[in-house]
Every structure is written in structure tokens, then in C-alpha cells.
């Protein structure tokens, strides 16, 4: 029951996380124009991975895509790639995990197959979450670098001419959505991996039994030695027959010429 709950919760958490990664990737507010000390108030600019938007003082908003590929920074391309890889891995992970769910029966699929699928989807979710977190962090680092470079230019300028007052950008909402979503996907993946351990069928445990023959007249009763699966009636390692057989716990330590191990 706990395994099913862990697996189900892991799936739901990952699903929310991947939905968040998709939302963050599509959002336009990855960076927003820093308004502090900016003399230009007629326009407010915010930018995403795919397009830039301007909201004018009149209330009119217009967005334009970055139609050039070569003119864009390599870091932006890297962030795009990381987010897309995260989405693709997450989507495949979701597909695999649906079939791996313990509460869903598909033909005669064995528990070992479900365990492997759960582990696979868990690893995919972990990598997906890491991709999203990495992508968002790289973008955030790019913004911080750009911000301080712009601030430096603001106060030094080139030849006494201040160059970039209006080019400072700060963290947009998409960064926080991406961080949280990546974290959720990662947590969901870890939960799936934990659930996998519980799903794997238990190995048959043959309990060691020592036989103590008390006399030559002891008759061996076939079928007395049973494999314990943890589900049978002999879960406490009780005596199965009386013919001198003892469990390890019950064996006596006094020496005898008839002792056989």
C-alpha cells in the first residue's frame, strides 16, 4: 500500500513539475526590465526564450520573436536546449510511468517489469528536473552578469557618455516557475526510484535450519522443510515437524555424538 502511494505521489508530483517546466519554457517573463533609476518610463520590456514583449504607457502590448538564430547568444541557445531536453525526457518519463503504475493492470505484466519501468521513469524525471534547474540557473547567471556589466557602464560610461541605462534586466516570473517545477520533477523522480525498491519482487528466503537427531528411530517426514516467502503460515519459523528438527533459534548447544549439521 505504501509503495503504491509513493509511486502514485511521485507520478503526480512529476506531472505537476513537467507541466511547470513546459509553462516556464513558454512564458515571456524570463527577464524583466529593471525600472530602478531608468529615465525611460514610456515602455516596459520583458523577455522570454522565444520572444520579446513591450508594454507601452498607453497599455498597448506588442511581442516579437527572435527570428535570427546566429545573432542570439550561445547561452540562450543552451538554455533553450536544456529546457527542451527536460520536457522531452519528462514526457517520455510520464508515458513510461503510466504503464508502471501498480494500480493499473496491463495484461499479465510482472512486478519486476513494473519495477524496472518505475526506475526508468524515476531516472528520467530526475534528469528532466536537473535539466530544467540547470537551464534556469544558466539564464539567471546570464542576467546577473548582464546586470552588473550594465551597472558598471552606467557609472563609468564610454568617453564620459553613459551607454546603457535602459538595458538592465532582472529575474522574471518564469525563472521561479522553472526552479520550482524542476525541483518538483526531481522530487517526483526520487519518489519513483524509492517506490521501485518496494515494487521489486522479494527474493525467496530459505531459512537455515539445523537438524538435531535425538535418536536412530526418527522418521523423516518429507515436505516438512518449506521455503518461506513471507506470506505463508510459517512466517515465525515455527517447528514444521517434531523429528528433532530445530530452527536456528531453538537449537541447543550441548554436544552429542549424534549431532549433524
Amino acid at each position: 500500500m505504501a509503495v503504491t502511494a509513493c509511486q502514485g505521489l511521485g507520478f503526480v508530483v512529476s506531472l505537476i513539475g513537467i507541466a511547470g517546466i513546459i509553462a516556464a519554457t513558454c512564458m515571456d517573463q524570463w527577464s524583466t526590465q529593471d525600472l530602478y533609476n531608468n529615465p525611460v518610463t514610456a515602455v516596459f520590456n520583458y523577455q522570454g526564450l522565444w520572444r520579446s514583449c513591450v508594454r507601452e504607457s498607453s497599455g498597448f502590448t506588442e511581442c516579437r520573436g527572435y527570428f535570427t538564430l546566429l545573432g542570439l547568444p550561445a547561452m540562450l541557445q543552451a538554455v533553450r536546449a536544456l529546457m527542451i531536453v527536460g520536457i522531452v525526457l519528462g514526457a517520455i518519463g510520464l508515458l513510461v510511468s503510466i504503464f508502471a503504475l501498480k494500480c493499473i493492470r496491463i495484461g499479465s505484466m510482472e512486478d519486476s517489469a513494473k519495477a524496472n519501468m518505475t526506475l526508468t521513469s524515476g531516472i528520467m524525471f530526475i534528469v528532466s528536473g536537473l535539466c530544467a534547474i540547470a537551464g534556469v540557473s544558466v539564464f539567471a547567471n546570464m542576467l546577473v552578469t548582464n546586470f552588473w556589466m550594465s551597472t558598471a557602464n552606467m557609472y563609468t560610461g564610454m568617453g564620459g557618455m553613459v551607454q546603457t541605462v535602459q538595458t538592465r534586466y532582472t529575474f522574471g516570473a518564469a525563472l521561479f516557475v522553472g526552479w520550482v517545477a524542476g525541483g518538483l520533477t526531481l522530487i517526483g523522480g526520487v519518489m519513483m526510484c524509492i517506490a521501485c525498491r518496494g515494487l521489486a519482487p522479494e527474493e525467496t528466503n530459505y531459512k537455515a535450519v539445523s537438524y538435531h537427531a535425538s535418536g536412530h528411530s526418527v522418521a523423516y517426514k518429507p515436505g516438512g522443510f518449506k521455503a518461506s516467502t513471507g506470506f505463508g503460515s510459517n512466517t515465525k519459523n515455527k517447528k514444521i515437524y517434531d523429528g528433532g528438527a530445530r530452527t536456528e533459534d531453538e537449537v541447543q548447544s550441548y554436544p552429542s555424538k549424534h549431532d549433524y549439521v
Partner: nanobody, 118 residues
Framework: EVQLVESGGGLVQPGGSLRLSCAAS????????MGWWRQAPGSQRELVAI???????QYGDSVKGRFTISRDNAKNTVYLQMASLKPEDTAVYYC????????????WGQGTQVTVSL
């Protein structure tokens, strides 16, 4: 690369008028503003006026009611009509194009001198 060519500066008497123009050549990202900034000797750069690609206009506090900015999007040109000029308007006037492509870009003209004096 975007190139800006300014013209129209010169010497004018107080109360007089002057018209500055700035033509931008090259590929400019669709979301942008074109405008004018000025810098007097020993002073910080100051916003004069800007005109956005969407039609919004903003003036600096010191020139409101006296200066008029206009923009011809087809020609990628911005004009600044200056009237009722005062001696304190004396400065180097710089044309600026700011594009809102990824993390923004600034392009500046070489500047044109405007002197208001008797």
C-alpha cells in the same frame, strides 16, 4: 550593424528654433525606441525625448511643451523640433536607438552640437 547619422545642429539665439534629424541604417529589431539625449559639459546625460515603435512618446521634464519629437518608421528616421530655446539647452545632442531584442541593444550617434547664445 546599425549606423546613426545626425544632422541639424548649430548656433541659435535664445527663443529661436532648430530641427534635428537622425537617420538609422541597418537592420533594426521591430520592438525599439528612437530618441534624443543631451549632455552639457560636466553634466550627466539627460533624456530629451523618445518615440517608441508602438507610437508612445516621452519627454524629459526640462523640455516639455517646447520640444516635439516625431518619427518616420518607413525611413527609420526620428526628428526633434526644438522651439523657445534657452541658453541652458546648450549641449551635445545624441541620437539613440534602443532595440528590445534579447537583453536589449543600444546604438548611439556621434552627437551634434547645439549652442544657444546671443
Amino acid at each position: 550593424e546599425v549606423q546613426l547619422v545626425e544632422s541639424g545642429g548649430g548656433l541659435v539665439q535664445p527663443g529661436g528654433s532648430l530641427r534635428l534629424s537622425c537617420a538609422a541604417s541597418g537592420s533594426i529589431f521591430g520592438l525599439n525606441f528612437m530618441g534624443w539625449w543631451r549632455q552639457a559639459p560636466g553634466s550627466q546625460r539627460e533624456l530629451v525625448a523618445i518615440a517608441t515603435s508602438g507610437g508612445s512618446i516621452q519627454y524629459g521634464d526640462s523640455v516639455k511643451g517646447r520640444f516635439t519629437i516625431s518619427r518616420d518608421n518607413a525611413k527609420n528616421t526620428v526628428y526633434l523640433q526644438m522651439a523657445s530655446l534657452k541658453p541652458e539647452d546648450t549641449a551635445v545632442y545624441y541620437c539613440n536607438v534602443h532595440t528590445y531584442d534579447f537583453l536589449g541593444r543600444d546604438y548611439w550617434g556621434q552627437g551634434t552640437q547645439v549652442t544657444v547664445s546671443l
